[in-house]
Interface confidence: low
């Protein structure tokens, strides 16, 4: 088949995979006149990764409340078992009736754009329903999401949110739009309006065209004991226990207090939809109580006292004391001072000893004073605030707040990498790679104290030795380790990290990074001796920086072979000497050779080897470096990238034959000549030709 360049450019040539994962096709190029030799286009197919969504994709939310998305709601997985951190949701279309936000990043108030499945599992992705100005009974919201995790194809998801007054909601004991209760002065009367009692959300369950023909019927099931209810000035009684939402809205319902004390009053009722002309209709209904607080006209309101934040560790429980919640009220007993939770933080809940395990929304000063009220920190370690209303039962409620700071139960110092100090500098800044503190989240406010200092250096901040520093200073690159003693290639120090009252220790390792250029090049021939010179190892920059001759000490290796000093001329006595130390000058003089051995006890073939060296220079710490190289059986036809001082015995024998091929030392400047001297004048001639050419 023939395909044109324009078809390729236009994206019209497709590859359809079938069969094995590895393969491809052969092709030739032709311009009509010339044809290139065959080419092979390799294609590797990847197994398709598929994303799938489980979970109900439905979220039930109480009106005006916050509900976390959970794995039951939204659970993504992939056929490749992808880490939940890498399963990313993008919010294509956010909620219309509220907002989506992250529990630990809620400071900006910005709409959430991305989140991961891991964050869903952690309960950190929250839907908050915002109460609309217009009443409703049940509302549906929809979030359009796109799930992605390359290389899988994106998956669109719809999260359906149901917000309903029908649900039993601990945060909102009433099923009505409003049921706030009433305050009335002793012996006086007060109007009950839709600001205090409003069932228009029941009406909202009726389609708007028919809504005007419907009403809500309130049936009083228990009358007030210390006063009277009147509708249009007519008292309600057992024979006539009803009033309507429309009468409430018109301001026709009144409570008249009978005097004689300031005890609580109220009434119980059942509310349900009523059809045209009083006909009964199916629809929502509720049974509730309406609280009436009778206020002493002469009473002084309670005075809230300053509050100290409560601090406790994540996962624990702590009692609330008068330090957190107290009021001055000479007229009221502690049991008469009531607190009500208006809004709770996400980091835990209040509970009463002996009051069940669940959260409480109402308690008294007596509960606080007796130590019965406690906070349970079951959320993340963040600060949170309870918004409370406090009342003595006679004055209007006063807003109060209780701050709770959750401390992590444990912290961990993360050490991602040792600190590397460049050899010529002798100093380096610490970063998050060396020191970073995490609890259940990152702890940017962490502080560090040196509990075991380094042996060969100092920690400096602003150029001065220090034994204490902060995470902020680390992040700004202000904390520096500097070697003060040039006798060791490594060091370590121990720190104690402190974050929000919790500590942990860690050891930071320090290593010196050698200022050495290493070029191993391609494979080196086994059985040959090659020249070690600055094309292979070069500490010239270190020499310039320190104005000294760097020294090398062989610490280890090679496993197969040895480093030798080669004689300067054929008159020099003895053969090559084993070397354990050498200098940069030796490298530059070409006095060093590496005899590359053959691995014993195995078939000839490619192998790996290395040299470990310690590099010293004046006024700087030593550093350990390694020269890793590959070896292979000698191949006379291959051009080696290093100067060869000798080739294997067998190859020399071969070299005497006229048809033998010779090694070349390309591209080194002192490469062996095409006709190696070893063939004519023996081994020393070969050395001379290569060493001093």
């Amino acid at each position: 088949r023939t395909r044109s360049g324009s078809q390729l450019d236009g994206g019209l040539v497709l590859f359809s995979h079938r069969g094995t994962l590895d393969g491809g096709f052969r092709f030739r190029l032709s311009d009509g006149e010339h044809t290139s030799p065959g080419h092979f286009f390799r294609v590797t197919a990847q197994k398709q990764v598929l994303l799938s969504l489980k979970g109900s994709q439905t979220l039930t939310v109480c009106p005006g409340s916050v509900q976390p998305l959970s794995s039951q709601t939204l659970r993504a997985s992939s056929s490749a078992g992808t880490d939940p951190q890498l399963l990313l949701y993008r919010v294509v279309r956010g909620p219309q009736l509220g907002r989506l936000f992250h529990a630990q990043q809620d400071s900006t108030g910005e709409a959430l754009v991305n989140f991961t499945q891991a964050e869903v599992y952690a309960g950190n992705i929250l839907y908050e329903h915002e109460m609309p100005p217009e009443p409703f009974w049940e509302a549906h919201d929809t979030l359009e999401l796109q799930l992605s995790s390359p290389p899988a194809r994106d998956v669109a998801a719809t999260l359906a949110v149901a917000v309903s007054f029908e649900a039993a909601c601990p945060q909102r004991p009433s099923h009505l739009w409003k049921n706030k209760g009433l305050w009335v002065p002793e012996g006086q009367r007060a109007r009950i309006t839709v600001a205090a009692l409003d069932a228009s959300n029941l009406l909202a369950s009726v389609p708007s065209p028919q809504r005007s023909e419907h009403d809500v019927l309130f049936q009083v099931t228990q009358f007030p004991s210390r006063g009277q209810l009147l509708v249009s000035e007519e008292p309600l009684h057992a024979g006539q226990p009803h009033f309507l939402q429309s009468q409430l809205a018109a301001g026709q319902l009144v409570y008249a207090h009978g005097g004689g004390g300031t005890q609580q009053d109220g009434f119980h009722f059942r509310a349900h939809l009523q059809g045209p002309a009083g006909a009964s209709v199916a629809g929502p209904q509720t049974s509730e109580a309406f609280a009436i607080t009778v206020r002493d006209v002469n009473e002084r309101p309670p005075q809230p006292q300053a509050s100290v934040p409560l601090r406790l560790t994540r996962g624990s429980r702590a009692p609330i004391s008068r330090a957190q919640l107290s009021v001055v009220d000479p007229d009221s007993a502690p049991g008469e001072i009531e607190y009500e939770v208006q809004r709770a933080p996400h980091n835990g809940f209040l509970s009463l000893v002996g009051g069940g395990l669940g959260p409480v929304t109402r308690f008294t000063q007596a509960d606080v004073d007796s130590g019965r009220l406690a906070f349970v920190a079951n959320g993340s370690s963040v600060a949170g605030i309870f918004q409370l209303s406090m009342s003595d039962g006679a004055s209007p409620p006063l807003p109060m707040s209780l701050a709770v700071d959750i401390l992590p139960s444990a912290i961990e110092v993360q050490l991602r990498a040792p600190l590397e100090v460049p050899q010529a500098l002798g100093r380096s800044s610490l970063s998050q790679q060396q020191l970073r503190v995490v609890s259940d989240r990152e702890e940017p406010e962490a502080a560090y104290r040196l509990i075991q200092g380094p042996q060969y250096g100092h920690l400096l901040v602003g150029g001065r030795p220090t034994s204490a520093f902060s995470q902020f200073q680390i992040d700004q690159g202000e904390v520096v380790f500097a070697f003060t003693n040039s006798s060791s290639s490594h060091d370590h120090f121990r720190v104690l990290a402190l974050a929000r009252g919790v500590n942990a220790s860690a050891v930071v390792n320090v290593t010196v990074r050698a200022l050495l250029h290493v070029w191993a090049g391609g494979p080196w021939p086994q059985g040959a001796t090659l020249r070690l010179d600055p094309t292979v190892l070069d500490a010239g920059e270190l020499a310039n920086r320190t104005d000294s001759v760097p020294r090398f000490r062989l610490l280890e290796g090679p496993r197969h072979g040895r480093v030798v000093r080669v004689p300067r001329a054929r008159t020099e006595p003895g053969g090559s000497q084993l070397v354990e130390q050498f200098t940069q000058q030796d490298l530059e003089d070409g006095r060093l050779g590496l005899e590359v051995g053959r691995p014993e006890g195995r078939a000839p073939g490619p192998a790996g080897d290395s040299l470990t060296l310690e590099l010293w220079a004046q006024g700087v710490p030593p550093a350990v470096a390694s020269l890793d190289f590959a070896t292979e059986p000698y191949n006379a036809a291959r051009p080696y990238s290093v100067a060869l001082l000798s080739v294997p015995e067998a190859a020399r024998t071969e070299a005497g034959k006229p048809e033998s091929s010779t090694p070349t030392g390309e591209p080194g400047p002192m490469a062996s000549s095409p006709e190696p001297a070893v063939a004519k004048g023996g081994f020393l001639s070969f050395l001379e030709a290569n060493m001093f050419s």
Partner: antibody, heavy 117, light 113 residues
Amino acid sequence: QVQLVQSGAEVKRPGASMKVSCKASGYTFTNYYIHWVRQAPGQGLEWMGWINPNSGATNYAQKFQGRVTMTRDTSTSTVYMELSSLRSEDTAVYYCAKSWVSWFASWGQGTLVTVSS
Amino acid sequence: DIVMTQSPDSLAVSLGERATINCKSSQSVLNSSNNRNYLAWYQQKPGQPPKLLIYWASTRESGVPDRFSGSGSGTDFTLTISGLQAEDVAVYYCQQHYSTPFTFGPGTKVDIK
């Protein structure tokens, strides 16, 4: 009161399609999900999927994916369920059910669909 | 998918006696965020659609007699009819409403002994 009234029984040939309707009354149609559940003769109940009448969003059981389509007409408060490529094992009573999120509080009377050659 | 199983397949109980039906889910249906078990029970009489009895494992639907009660948590649930009446003869199904696809148990037939 809440009522879900379904269309009448049908007899279909294998390979054909069926379309069952479910007319809702007595509540705000767009406020509640409608689910479809079927029951083969003498067998148990099998959930097929849901539709949100407010947005038209749907969620089908994997088994019926590609064969089932649920739609709604808000002007008549009616939901439709169409099943294509019918086979004899699709013979069943098909129920629509109103839910508050996920449990089925009210059910239609059921529509018997017989698939036979 | 969550698989639901029921036991026994059928049972016969004398009038006024207690009938107990068990239901097991292949994975937990407890939603930790609101501490509710997403399990419902239905009653189906011949020729009729199913009728909701219990949702959230133990919440009785309005209008359902209080002789019907639900209990259990996680993966194991029970429907109890405390004093069987003649009108209770039916097939009873459990259903998980925790995640899609919503699935039903195979049903338990209750008769009078």
